[in-house]
């Protein structure tokens, strides 16, 4: 009797278990009692990444330079093109359909993790003993100057935005 379920990499149609098309190929015709499934390779600008019964291949993603995108990995018949962002930009989403400039860490914050093509700058507040007085996408919090090692004393305390100010020791007894 006709099957009601099929094996892996098969599909049921017209009471037949037909072979799925392999990745990189699209369905031309279903199998019959007397013939195999017929598949054709995707064209150069297309892909299918799974065993499938699709009658059309998917277009490779276009990495639009106007959106700050560039090709990270060229697509094949079995894989989509992977886009990344140009220098100084990162993706707005996991699918990387557009790019935005990396954010800078404001004074009082330092760079915890430098941005990549797919992730933004991660900032962290400068802890006690550290400061950042610039807006930067690269600079970490810097430690306060150690006045003691210069044989100086702290004249003005540091903050998360400013370094300490050192001065000479008072020579009066």
């Amino acid at each position: 009797e006709p099957p009601t379920a099929c094996r892996e990499k098969q599909y049921l149609i017209n009471s037949q278990c037909c072979s799925l098309c392999q990745p990189g190929q699209k369905l031309v015709s279903d199998c019959t009692e007397f013939t195999e499934t017929e598949c054709l390779p995707c064209s150069e600008s297309e892909f299918l990444d799974t065993w499938n019964r699709e009658t059309r291949c998917h277009q490779h993603k276009y990495c639009d330079p106007n959106l700050g995108l560039q090709v990270q990995q060229k697509g094949t018949s079995e894989t989509d093109t992977i886009c990344t962002c140009e220098e100084g930009l990162h993706c707005t989403s996991e699918s990387c359909e557009s790019c935005v400039p990396h954010r800078s860490c404001l004074p009082g914050f330092g760079v915890k993790q430098i941005a990549t093509g797919v992730s933004d700058t991660i900032c962290e507040p400068c802890p006690v003993g550290f400061f950042s007085n610039v807006s930067s996408a690269f600079e970490k919090c810097r430690p306060w100057t150690s006045c003691e090692t210069k044989d100086l004393v702290v004249q003005q305390a540091g903050t998360n935005k400013t370094d300490v100010v050192c001065g000479p020791q008072d020579r009066q007894r």
Epitope: S19, V28, S29, D30, T32, E33, F34, T35, E36
Partner: antibody, heavy 112, light 112 residues
Framework: EVQLQESGPGLVKPSETLSLTCTVS?????????WNWIRQPPGKGLEWMGY???????NYNPSLKNRVTISRDTSKNQFSLKLSSVTAADTAVYYC?????WGQGTTVTVSS | DAQMTQSPSSLSASVGDRVTITCRSS???????????LNWFQQKPGKAPKLLIY???NRFSGVPSRFSGSGSGTDFTLTISSLQPEDFATYYC?????????FGQGTKLEIK
């Protein structure tokens, strides 16, 4: 339901060309399947002659030595057989078939 | 070509008997996907063949369960588990894995 019906002359003279048409109803010949011609000489077994596929491409039995041509008219949902340079050995019942469905057959006699 | 040899060429049996017809191919009928396109047909005098079994062991719609097919590679069997009066006919195997498609020479099943 799928139905096939052969038509054509029942008598052909030696050296002439045998021409038969198969009219298909209940299924489009461009959808899928291979559309075959099969013959059976009197009192003998079945012989596959060739097919035309849903996409219009063909395959023929080499034993017929390039005498056979199968074509189609998609507007009429028909496919046709031409067999050239016939002899008495080509006298047979000719069937058109999708293999799961067959025409009832038409007898062709080659005689002068 | 894949030559198909059927045995026996004729067979006498009685209603209720279990009957086995074999078909042997000169080359394997299993294709690269692991599928085997071996079919069995029944033909009665003056009628077109009817599909019984496709892809070795699949009964075509409407075919009684007493008909079964088995085999692999080059050796195939059609079994009728309990002969009925309407089963007396000629049986053909047909391979459609390789072009040209080829039929066995037929097995005539007669009433004893």
């Amino acid at each position: 339901e799928v139905q096939l019906q052969e038509s054509g002359p029942g008598l052909v003279k030696p050296s002439e060309t045998l021409s038969l048409t198969c009219t298909v109803s209940g299924y489009s010949i461009t959808s899928n399947y291979y559309w075959n011609w099969i013959r059976q000489p009197p009192g003998k077994g079945l012989e596959w002659m060739g097919y035309i596929r849903y996409d219009g491409s063909n395959n023929y039995n080499p034993s017929l030595k390039n005498r056979v041509t199968i074509s189609r008219d998609t507007s009429k949902n028909q496919f046709s057989l031409k067999l050239s340079s016939v002899t008495a050995a080509d006298t047979a019942v000719y069937y058109c078939a999708r293999l799961d469905y067959w025409g009832q057959g038409t007898t062709v006699t080659v005689s002068s | 070509d894949a030559q198909m040899t059927q045995s026996p060429s004729s067979l006498s049996a009685s209603v209720g008997d279990r009957v086995t017809i074999t078909c042997r191919s000169s080359q394997s009928l299993e294709n690269t996907n692991g599928n085997t396109f071996l079919n069995w047909f029944q033909q009665k005098p003056g009628k077109a063949p009817k599909l019984l079994i496709y892809r070795v062991s699949n009964r075509f719609s409407g075919v009684p369960s007493r008909f079964s097919g088995s085999g692999s590679g080059t050796d195939f069997t059609l079994t009728i588990s309990s002969l009925q009066p309407e089963d007396f006919a000629t049986y053909y195997c047909l391979q459609v894995t390789h072009v040209p498609f080829t039929f066995g020479q037929g097995t005539k099943l007669e009433i004893k």
